[in-house]
Amino acid sequence: GNLTVAVVLPLANTSYPWSWARVGPAVELALARVKARPDLLPGWTVRTVLGSSENALGVCSDTAAPLAAVDLKWEHNPAAFLGPGCVYAAAPVGRFTAHWRVPLLTAGAPALGFGVKDEYALTTRAGPSYAKLGDFVAALHRRLGWERQALMLYAYRPGDEEHCFFLVEGLFMRVRDRLNITVDHLEFAEDDLSHYTRLLRTMPRKGRVIYICSSPDAFRTLMLLALEAGLCGEDYVFFHLDIFGQSLQGGQGPAPRRPWERGDGQDVSARQAFQAAKIITYKEPDNPEYLEFLKQLKHLAREQFNFTMEDGLVNTIPASFHDGLLLYIQAVTETLAHGGTVTDGENITQRMWNRSFQGVTGYLKIDSSGDRETDFSLWDMDPETGAFRVVLNYNGTSQELVAVSGRKLNWPLGYPPPDIPKCGFDNEDPACNQDHLSTLE
Amino acid sequence: GNLTVAVVLPLANTSYPWSWARVGPAVELALARVKARPDLLPGWTVRTVLGSSENALGVCSDTAAPLAAVDLKWEHNPAAFLGPGCVYAAAPVGRFTAHWRVPLLTAGAPALGFGVKDEYALTTRAGPSYAKLGDFVAALHRRLGWERQALMLYAYRPGDEEHCFFLVEGLFMRVRDRLNITVDHLEFAEDDLSHYTRLLRTMPRKGRVIYICSSPDAFRTLMLLALEAGLCGEDYVFFHLDIFGQSLQGGQGPAPRRPWERGDGQDVSARQAFQAAKIITYKEPDNPEYLEFLKQLKHLAREQFNFTMEDGLVNTIPASFHDGLLLYIQAVTETLAHGGTVTDGENITQRMWNRSFQGVTGYLKIDSSGDRETDFSLWDMDPETGAFRVVLNYNGTSQELVAVSGRKLNWPLGYPPPDIPKCGFDNEDPACNQDHLSTLE
């Protein structure tokens, strides 16, 4: 028989991690693997039908995506949907597929809301999600003894689909659930000079452990401002929520692993400021299959999709689509073996959830509500060389922090700064306000 | 032939102005009129198919509505859609119908965004819209010499679909377009006591001409607070944006036309405070056909829909659906007479736009972009009796303010207060800061 998978992803714009130019080759490789394995869907052909989640400007759209989904449903009555990745595009599509009782598989849609499976029934996320970032940060706080206060700053940038809003939303809500902790959050516009003044006034009053979701340039700017204002590494720690590791990539941007470097006359200060910085990214899979997969992926992208794929963590997304599609096909195969049909979305989905799977991204665990356990890396600066390197990894499945041997977190005082200063944010602790003259009564 | 109109409105919840229990009888009356008129769609049967815009809780939903629209499109391939009325429900449906090139007719969806016909192609609004309120207010400002500054306060109330946000958005944007004027706007939560403190501090610094969109109770509270703070009718004017005239209705609420009355021991003060208040509502049609229509509407609602319809401006909405549907059928009839088909959405829509029509709501003009010109009434207090009455009507078609004979606006000083106080909001006018001691050099 024919198994039809309807794809709703950006078909023209190649800049999204889940653009078809990136995911298409991964799907091709997955389907080639299915063909090569006699145990997967024997006697069946898997075919993909495409719809675009972009509007005429090539931007993800909450109108184009559901319209594409509706058209594909009408014309092809697919067994499953692949994508969308963008939050605003995925939301209406996921609600539609839930209504139709058709499985939706994505390695995007990382926002908190998609974890609510009453609304997004049969949606499986084979990629990372922002609430899982919260699990990592909660574990980090427990390890470092920060159980009282944190501050989260997130950038608004026109046209970036409120990436940082959704990231901080997932992080904030999950950290608050996991720890009994006060978390303040503040939005700023990266291109609005007055906002930096406001942040500068807010940071000392609201946090010592500060998470920042922004572009690499804006993070570096904030670090320079912090240095200037004396918010130094002894008392403060700044985490750059740079999940795809853009600031660590080199290329047109900063030098590889030297996210403070720009050649703008401020590098000396920036390097000093970055002593108080750490960077959080997704973890790069380190299994040999992933490297082999990347080689094939890049080759196929160039040959068949006329697209040159850069290196970087962004490639974990197509890899996760690949693994998710294989997991789906595995679940369909089992459902058929148990007398079910390809239209039995509930049954197929249940076989994907609460399940482990060895994929090109390594060991993959889908939790009991259909979301992948996500691994993260924490990068810190080597004070000798100024280069950043991974010092700690987080295993989402075991929820453990695993130190990289021979490396440790760099703290100017030798230990992490407290999350609330000794005398409180406004020097409100009475013990700190005593007259320093001792008087004899 | 068969002409199918797909209805997407709240089918269970009767509280919306566009609930099916209210609009259904109006549609029945319109279709009865079509049957009775041999010149309208001769030889054709008009049938309605229903889909609900509500979720399981009976609340308008941006998921349920487009899903209903999609299901109706698949099953019935309708020639047109009627509804939705709620902003969040109408938005995705209107974008879908635009994509399908199917006309959408509503007497709801009053928000500014629906005026952008690039996005909402073939959407005709036969009811009032908030940008038209801006046309009225701009005309009022011109008449009263307020061309510099205004303040708009709008209430957030859980579950009211951000009615006041959308109302003030349309008003604000249109007033700003029509006049070169500074307009500040501020949201407040009706149930948050601290917000009233903030408003009290803000009003003297930001406005003398103040528009307030809120429940009648919250408006009365603000008027009492204003009186208490000495923001009196000589210097201030407060407009209650009470478009359906809830505060004027009596019944369970305030006494008819005495919106200040509650019997809570504060009526004397409230009456005094309301000397500085005026109320803006939609205009009640005053043509005899409307009264006759209302009689039939209420009867049909009770008999066939088991719903008892109250009096009030809210009934202008079903009446507008009635007139809009007749206008649509008139346009279809003409299109067919010119060799077109019922599926020719563009042609049919063009025949509805930039057109006048005599309906049960009186003279109805659809502008060149498919939105009805809207009439408003301005109510003011009779200082003798304390009762409010209409002193001024606004004709949306002619864009004229028409005084009600024998009545005039009540100003404590005999003239409208200036929109910026004589010495500026912060007493910044140097002429007001002169030393009052004259010194001889």
Epitope: L193, T197, L200, A229, D264, G265, S269 | -
Partner: antibody, heavy 123, light 107 residues
Framework: EVQLVESGGGLVQPGRSLRLSCAAS????????MHWVRQAPGKGLEWVSG????????GYADSVKGRFTMSRDNAKNSLYLQMNSLRPEDTALYYC????????????????WGQGTMVTVSS | DIQMTQSPSSLSASVGDKVTITCRAS??????LNWYQQKPGKAPKVLIS???SLQSGVPSRFSGSGSGTDFTLTISSLQPEDFAVFYC?????????FGQGTKVEIK
Amino acid sequence: EVQLVESGGGLVQPGRSLRLSCAASGFTFDDYAMHWVRQAPGKGLEWVSGISWNSGTIGYADSVKGRFTMSRDNAKNSLYLQMNSLRPEDTALYYCAKDMGVSLALWGAFDIWGQGTMVTVSS
Amino acid sequence: DIQMTQSPSSLSASVGDKVTITCRASQNIRTYLNWYQQKPGKAPKVLISTASSLQSGVPSRFSGSGSGTDFTLTISSLQPEDFAVFYCQQSFGIPRTFGQGTKVEIK
């Protein structure tokens, strides 16, 4: 009204010193970085020095580094440029300018300028 | 240091003409480029910041574009009051640097 008024210019011999001042009014002085820009007679604009809101970063053009010192007194809404070891090529109209941002780490343009004070270095 | 090179150094144009001035940076400065106008005997005035943001009060006939190393200031229809010297300036790095200026004269 937002304004900057420079003072302290004049005729000075090579090798001597001069101190320029700039008085700011009409805006929150300690919310902005400030700059000195000069213009030699008949020539273009040359950035001399810039200072962040709290003096945390101070930058100089190579041509004045080691000779000029920029400072600010936020309590007095004042900006200063101490010019030592003056040279004939330092002859110029010296403008004080307000940055649109709080720091030199930002990218603010100079949105308010004074009318300038003339410094002439000649023997 | 980042060098800024403007071209042309001067130009003659008539009222109503479209005028284009270019500015090149010696390294990538993103969009951190500002344009100033200076009239004789007056202090400079900022027209455009971050390559394309028109400052309030500046007529809409002025526009800016570009990113990286190449930038343009365009005056769509030259008015009599526009005859002046125009400077570009980078705000990417320290030291800040100006272009050498472009003098726009009446033809």
